[in-house]
């Protein structure tokens, strides 16, 4: 179920997955929520005396049991990922942090009159992930009212330092507030030759596009279908970027599909989950568990309810079926995507819906007639 | 068009712009409306980009710079390239486009008449070539549709000018001995029309030339009269296929 409480002065021991810098515990929790494997986190709001570089450290953790031993640590805040908290799921982070310098690669500096204007500049710049604004009281006159647009390979600051009269924050692209525009085009038979930032295995170009949308540095992608000539690249989704923010003219390539990240979209922004169940397909990965259920939909539901499950394969092979149903293999991987996709007539595969938002509809399913 | 002048809106209502929408959108070729759902153009326009879904077809347009993402366009339902067209040769440079949805005819967007098979030997005297192509060999696409009047050149004479090529009877040539007026890059697939017995006819499809508007190097066009059977057969067989797939 959904565990949203935070534990003050508590640090989870072990289970370390990754460490990043975040300005507060709420942002750390968000980062954990959208990390493919993170279930628990610990955030250091206060630095240990000798380890000043650990302050603002966000330690993402996993656990087979879903819990880790807690130790007392002053200034530490710990909690759970919100992976199963449908209505609370949002990548949007609007908070502004006064007195903090969120450091990263400064790629643009310009004068602006307000923090809001600076945040808007960041939101409307394709490369900007976070920003720092120097107020009119900043100690160096030449930097006063300067807006620094920043980025990093992880999408989060490379370090965070307290500095008076600096204000930092994040791009609001994830809040669907960008005015850049949103190219929905999908180019069949075309490939982009630009720089690859990462690659994942996906069953189709639409999943590839969603993965690209939620990757911090992916601006566009090329997906190679199952018919692609190079076996090792079949069903591979290449996440790409470029200095200009635009792809170079696409190259004609049979069995390739290309398109753009939808992270700058206002209305068409996808959810970080994939509803479709792919029949005749098997997703390979680390085995988490296997149960016997009636149908692929039930298998998807089981995967969704199992917090560590990222994707599943449901097998209809005679040897995989019993009276209570057929084999539902719950699986996971380091990046949340299958390690390999194979085509098997008796298989159906899909993804956990743990990161899907629960839509609270105002239109009731059951209508109550007024008296 | 080299040596041409600006056209006015509705002057050549059969002229369409074939554009490719990839990272950016660009005018690639011209074409001619020959029916509510049919465009006639050059096969070579699709070399390397034979994918219907990236093409956008704009009719009733005079100025390309006025096209925005709100401008309505037609999409390709079916692309029919002549079965004998080869990328390594210059013959059979003809293609038919079936549109996803039929066009509404207006005074700015309507079809051009096709010649009859009997017109293969007709002598035309009032012929015009139109397009948004380059106005010089190393030029750029034009915003406003250009037009130029151009005399036809007999095939025997044309063959003498093009000793390294085969000028077949399915080609027709047009140009001035001294050069100066011709179709150019970006005009491909567009119409060479001639007024005959009071009506405009689609005599040629802009195909190729050695450079543009060079002296003694006429433009070479696909001779439409030689392909009437092919055009009618393809349109008919497409209709029959549509009947087969329509609900009972």
């Amino acid at each position: 179920g959904c565990l949203s409480q935070l534990y003050a002065n508590t640090f989870f021991r072990g289970g370390d997955l990754a460490a990043i810098y975040t300005p507060d515990a709420q942002h750390c929790q968000k980062m954990c929520t959208f990390h493919p494997r993170c279930l628990l986190f610990s955030f250091l709001a206060v630095s240990p005396t000798k380890e000043t570089d650990k302050r603002f450290g966000c330690f993402m953790k996993e656990s087979i049991t879903g819990t880790l031993p807690r130790i007392h640590r002053t200034g530490a805040i710990s909690g759970h990922s919100l992976k199963q908290c449908g209505h609370q799921l949002s990548a949007c982070h609007q908070d502004i942090y006064e007195g903090l310098d969120m450091r990263g690669s400064n790629f643009n500096i310009s004068k602006t009159d307000s923090i809001e204007e600076c945040q808007k500049l960041c939101t409307n710049n394709i490369h900007c992930q976070f920003f720092t604004y120097a107020t009119k009281a900043f100690h160096r006159p030449e930097y006063r009212k300067s807006c620094l647009l920043k980025r990093s390979s992880s999408g989060t600051p490379t370090s965070i330092k307290p500095v008076d009269n600096l204000v930092s924050g994040f791009s609001l692209k994830s809040c669907a507030l960008s005015e850049i525009g949103c190219p929905m085009d999908i180019f069949q038979h075309f490939a982009f030759a630009d720089l690859n930032v990462s690659q994942v295995v996906t069953p189709d170009a639409f999943v590839c596009r969603t993965v690209c949308t939620f990757h911090p540095n992916c601006l566009f992608f090329t997906f190679y279908t199952n018919e692609w000539e190079t076996e090792s690249q079949r069903n591979v989704c290449f996440l790409k970027t470029s200095k200009s923010g635009r792809p170079s003219p696409p190259i004609i390539q049979e069995n390739a599909v290309s398109g753009y990240s939808l992270f700058t979209c206002r209305k068409a922004r996808p959810e970080p989950c994939h509803f479709k169940i792919y029949s005749g397909v098997a997703f390979e990965g680390e085995e988490l568990n296997a149960t016997f259920v009636q149908g692929a939909d039930a298998c998807q539901e089981t995967c969704t309810k199992t917090i560590r499950c990222q994707f599943f394969t449901y097998s209809l092979l005679p040897q995989d079926c019993k009276a209570e149903g057929c084999k539902c293999s719950l699986r996971l991987s380091t990046d949340g995507s299958p390690t390999r996709i194979t085509y098997e007539a008796q298989g159906s595969s899909g993804y956990s819906l743990r990161l899907c938002k629960v839509v609270e509809s105002s239109d009731c399913t059951t209508k109550i007639n007024a008296r | 068009i080299v040596g041409g002048t600006n056209s006015s809106l509705g002057e050549w209502p059969w002229q369409v712009s074939l554009q490719v929408k990839l990272v950016s959108q660009n005018h690639m070729c011209g074409g001619s409306i020959i029916g509510r759902q049919w465009i006639l153009t050059a096969a070579h326009c699709f070399d390397g980009i034979p994918y219907p879904d990236v093409w956008r077809i704009y009719g009733g347009i005079l100025n390309l710079s006025e096209i925005t993402n709100k401008t309505p366009f037609s999409s390709i339902k079916e692309l029919i390239i002549h079965q004998k067209y080869k990328m390594s040769e210059g013959s059979y440079d003809i293609a038919l486009i079936k549109l996803q949805t039929p066009l509404n005819y207006t005074e700015f967007q309507k079809p051009i008449c096709l010649p009859s098979k009997a017109d293969t030997n007709t002598i035309y005297t009032n012929c015009w070539v139109t397009g948004w192509g380059y106005t010089k060999e190393r030029g750029e696409t034009q915003n406003i549709l250009q037009k130029a009047t151009i005399p036809l050149v007999p095939n025997e004479e044309c063959q003498k000018k093009y000793r390294d090529y085969v000028i077949t009877k399915q080609m027709i040539c047009a140009g001035y001995k001294e050069g100066g007026i011709d179709a150019c890059k970006g005009d491909s697939g567009g119409p060479l029309v001639c007024k005959h017995s009071g009506r405009w006819q689609l005599v040629g499809i802009t195909s190729w030339g050695e450079g543009c508007a060079r002296k003694e190097q006429p433009g070479v066009y696909t001779k439409v009269a030689e392909y009437i059977d092919w055009i009618l057969e393809k349109i008919q067989s497409s209709k029959e296929r549509a009947l087969e797939t329509s609900p009972a």
Epitope: - | A42, H44, D47, K86, M87, S88, E89, G90, S91, D93, G133, R163, D164, Y165, V166, A183, C184, K185, G186, D187, S188, T206, S207, W208, G209, E210, G211, C212
Partner: antibody, heavy 125, light 108 residues
Framework: EVQLLESGGGLVQPGGSLRLSCAAS????????MTWVRQAPGKGLEWVSY????????IYADSVKGRFTISRDNSKNTLYLQMNSLRAEDTAVYYC??????????????????WGQGTLVTVSS | EIVLTQSPGTLSLSPGERATLSCRTS???????LAWYQQKPGQAPRLLIY???SRATGIPDRFSGSGSGTDFTLTISRLEPEDFAVYYC?????????FGQGTKVEIK
């Protein structure tokens, strides 16, 4: 399947003559411009001559002009290169090639899409 | 005549690396008339790229051509063992038709 097969190469003394043939199959020979290209031992490629589809137009490299004659017999699907007054520097592998001439952006393209396997001509005393 | 200058003369690379071959022409060449060929020892040349950037039939997409005017480039995105050979650019924009002197791509 397009095929080009050269023959007629061999050893010849300086000042001598040789006639190379290239038998073509798998395409409409009379529609294509044809060319000869040569390659001296250990050296790069050198264009020699071309002939128009009808055979009425020929062009030569300066190094062979007046000594070599290109011709074709469209009824036999054969290309020829008559080489007279041969010199030591004419020693090379001679290739015949088909010149593809498609259309792109209202201009023609030109490239050698099919090549023969080559025939060696050695000019030596 | 139009002189084609290829550089470098020799390129020593390992399989998997990217190869960039340059071809400069002494006069403007219409890109429709520029081609690239590959030749292996004892074999006839093979057409790779025509019209400066169009891949010939059957040529793997790791080969790509670009350029216009007087500067043309052949790129092999990831060298395979079978790509080690001599590469020639050629123009047929003006007679006499001419070839570049070739670039040898050898195993490092």
């Amino acid at each position: 399947e397009v095929q080009l097969l050269e023959s007629g190469g061999g050893l010849v003394q300086p000042g001598g003559s040789l006639r190379l043939s290239c038998a073509a199959s798998g395409f409409t020979f009379s529609h294509y411009l044809m060319t000869w290209v040569r390659q001296a031992p250990g050296k790069g490629l050198e264009w020699v001559s071309y002939i128009s589809p009808s055979g009425g137009h020929t062009i030569y490299a300066d190094s062979v002009k007046g000594r070599f004659t290109i011709s074709r017999d469209n009824s036999k699907n054969t290309l020829y290169l008559q080489m007279n007054s041969l010199r030591a520097e004419d020693t090379a592998v001679y290739y015949c090639a088909r010149v593809a001439r498609g259309i792109a952006a209202r201009s023609r393209t030109s490239y050698f899409d099919y090549w023969g396997q080559g025939t060696l001509v050695t000019v030596s005393s | 005549e139009i002189v084609l200058t290829q550089s470098p003369g020799t390129l020593s690379l390992s399989p998997g690396e990217r190869a960039t071959l340059s071809c400069r022409t002494s006069q403007f060449v219409n890109s429709n008339y520029l081609a690239w060929y590959q030749q292996k020892p004892g074999q006839a040349p093979r057409l790779l790229i025509y019209g400066a950037s169009s891949r010939a039939t059957g040529i793997p997409d790791r080969f790509s051509g670009s350029g216009s005017g007087t500067d043309f480039t052949l790129t092999i995105s990831r060298l395979e063992p079978e790509d080690f050979a001599v590469y020639y650019c050629q123009q047929s924009s003006r007679t006499p038709w001419t070839f570049g002197q070739g670039t040898k791509v050898e195993i490092k």
